[in-house]
Interface confidence: low
């Protein structure tokens, strides 16, 4: 940026170099150039000369005034027109920033994804600040009263090995930037209650010919947690509304869930699980598509990942990978 230039004078900003977006600000330039009584002082913003709201204060100083400054960043510098100098002489420059103080962090959430070895804490940071904002995550054991602090710019992964103060903790987040500091409420957690089981994945689907054809969804998880509750949601891709089935699950074997679906319709399925009775769910799994056969079955030709159907005695869809997970709700 502009901070490394050799100055022949001084440039400063009131109320500050970093200020609240939308404020009125004044930028002052004071020349200190040998053998120069400046005829004129000029201001440049991002390389473009400003023409308005410039006031000469005295022989060596001028002020540039901005009303309702809304740019997150700008490089300012000023120059002097010196007698006997053909070109303007650079006086000094400064990078300025505008933004907002942080909002109070809320929705502080800490989870341990099974097998990750980390406790992941996230929060809603609120509105965009536009300026450098840091977060300090405080983790205080309710058993030993020991407190640890972690500095981050977004979320934080804390190794579970470093959580030596028992099972119960208070977690809170401080947000700070040049314009202010805010602190979240305290979240009380128990490490055993925030574990999210290893991701559940739908591996394949098949529709079996019968008096009433039925579709079987095969799904599994590598979790070692014994008591797991899961939800599978499904809908025709043309619908807005999901249907949800609930399961109490033991993942010692691949799960098979039966659905009686309309023929010749493309459906989408997702699954998610939680440790039974606990607070946090997995995000919904990748979208899994399956099209049911027409009512009069024909011979199966082939099966294909995610978005395939074939009429026949058995119609199968096989998952070989993950699409982007949709954990916000409906898809079109």
């Amino acid at each position: 940026g502009i901070t490394n230039i050799n100055c022949s004078g001084h440039i400063w900003v009131e109320p500050a170099t970093i200020f609240k977006m939308g404020m009125n600000i004044s930028i002052y330039c004071q020349a200190a150039i040998k053998n120069c009584q400046p005829r004129k002082l000029h201001f440049y913003k991002n390389g473009i000369k400003e023409r308005f709201q410039i006031t000469r204060i005295n022989k060596t100083t001028a002020r540039l005034w901005y009303k309702n400054f809304l740019e997150p960043h700008a490089s300012m510098y000023c120059t002097a027109e010196c007698p006997k100098h053909f070109q303007e002489t650079l006086i000094c420059g400064k990078d300025i920033s505008s933004g907002y103080p942080p909002d109070i962090p809320d929705e502080v959430t800490c989870v341990i994804y099974e097998y990750s070895g980390n406790m992941t804490c996230t929060w809603n940071a609120g509105k965009l600040t536009y300026i450098d904002t840091k977060y300090v995550v405080h983790v205080k054991s309710l058993e030993t009263e020991e407190e640890q602090q972690y500095l981050t710019s977004s979320y934080i992964n804390i190794s579970t090995d470093s959580l030596q103060g028992g099972k119960k903790y208070l977690v809170w987040v401080q947000a700070a930037n040049a314009l202010g500091m805010e602190e979240s409420k305290q979240l009380q957690i128990h490490l055993d209650d925030i574990v999210i089981p290893s991701a559940a994945v739908i591996s394949r689907a098949e529709t079996i010919n019968a008096t009433v054809p039925k579709t079987i969804i095969y799904w599994d998880s590598q979790t070692t947690i014994e008591k797991v509750s899961c939800e599978m949601r499904y809908k025709a891709t043309t619908n807005q509304t999901w249907n949800v089935k609930e399961f109490d699950t033991n993942f010692t074997y691949v799960q098979q869930s039966e659905f009686y679906l309309e023929p010749n319709i493309k459906y989408v399925f997702q699954v998610r699980c939680q440790e039974t009775g606990k607070r946090y769910w997995q995000p919904w799994s990748s979208l899994f598509f399956h099209k049911t056969p027409e009512t009069v079955p024909q011979v199966t030709s082939k099966a294909f990942q995610h978005d395939t159907w074939n009429s026949g005695l058995t119609v199968a869809s096989i998952s070989t990978g993950h699409l982007t997970s949709d954990n916000r709700g409906d898809i079109g």
Partner: antibody
Framework: EVQLQQSGAELVKPGASVKISCKAS????????MNWVKQSHGKSLEWIGN????????SYNQEFKGKATLTVDKSSSTAYMLLNSLTSEDSAVYYC??????????????WGQGTTLTVSS | DIVLTQTAPSVPVTPGESVSISCRSS???????????LYWFLQRPGQSPQLLIY???NLASGVPDRFSGSGSGTAFTLRISRVEAEDVGVYYC?????????FGSGTRLEIK
Amino acid sequence: EVQLQQSGAELVKPGASVKISCKASGYSFTDYIMNWVKQSHGKSLEWIGNINPYFGFTSYNQEFKGKATLTVDKSSSTAYMLLNSLTSEDSAVYYCSRGSYYGYETFFDYWGQGTTLTVSS
Amino acid sequence: DIVLTQTAPSVPVTPGESVSISCRSSKSLLHSNGNTYLYWFLQRPGQSPQLLIYRMSNLASGVPDRFSGSGSGTAFTLRISRVEAEDVGVYYCMQHLEYPYTFGSGTRLEIK
């Protein structure tokens, strides 16, 4: 209307245990911490501890660890305090009082009517 | 533990006059978030305590604005202007900056 209805007065013998209840109504029980406070006759108030009904997490004043055990029954929106190995020192009025889920909002905004415990042989 | 000291066991007051009740803390109750975690309660004879003031200066719901709280990090005052007969009872300060929450010994307000 928020109400905390406590169980009636108790007269118990030294060495025995007693379980005091506090039934909450008029708000979502699991959204607020429940505090318990002791007031000995003619004396000030002492905070015993609190319980987070959502998780069942408890925090105790060290003075009451081993003396008081706090539990909840979410289905009936009731908080309980079990006091064991009772002595005459435990004779007091015990209050339940609602507090925010988090330590830095309004605490103790609603109180039960109190349960009088008398320990005597 | 944080100790709260209420030096005056009782204060006599004439109805209609103002009165101040003081409370001192052994540790600053000013949190880094700018809040001061001191509460005031009134316990009328034969009743449960009632919240009057939270976070040093905030008036609890339903409490008359004759009551006000002020203070620094360690010295606090509850002021009652135009005292009424129904204001009699014991006034307690309480900190909930840190566990264990602690109460002052109480100051009894008596009508002359």
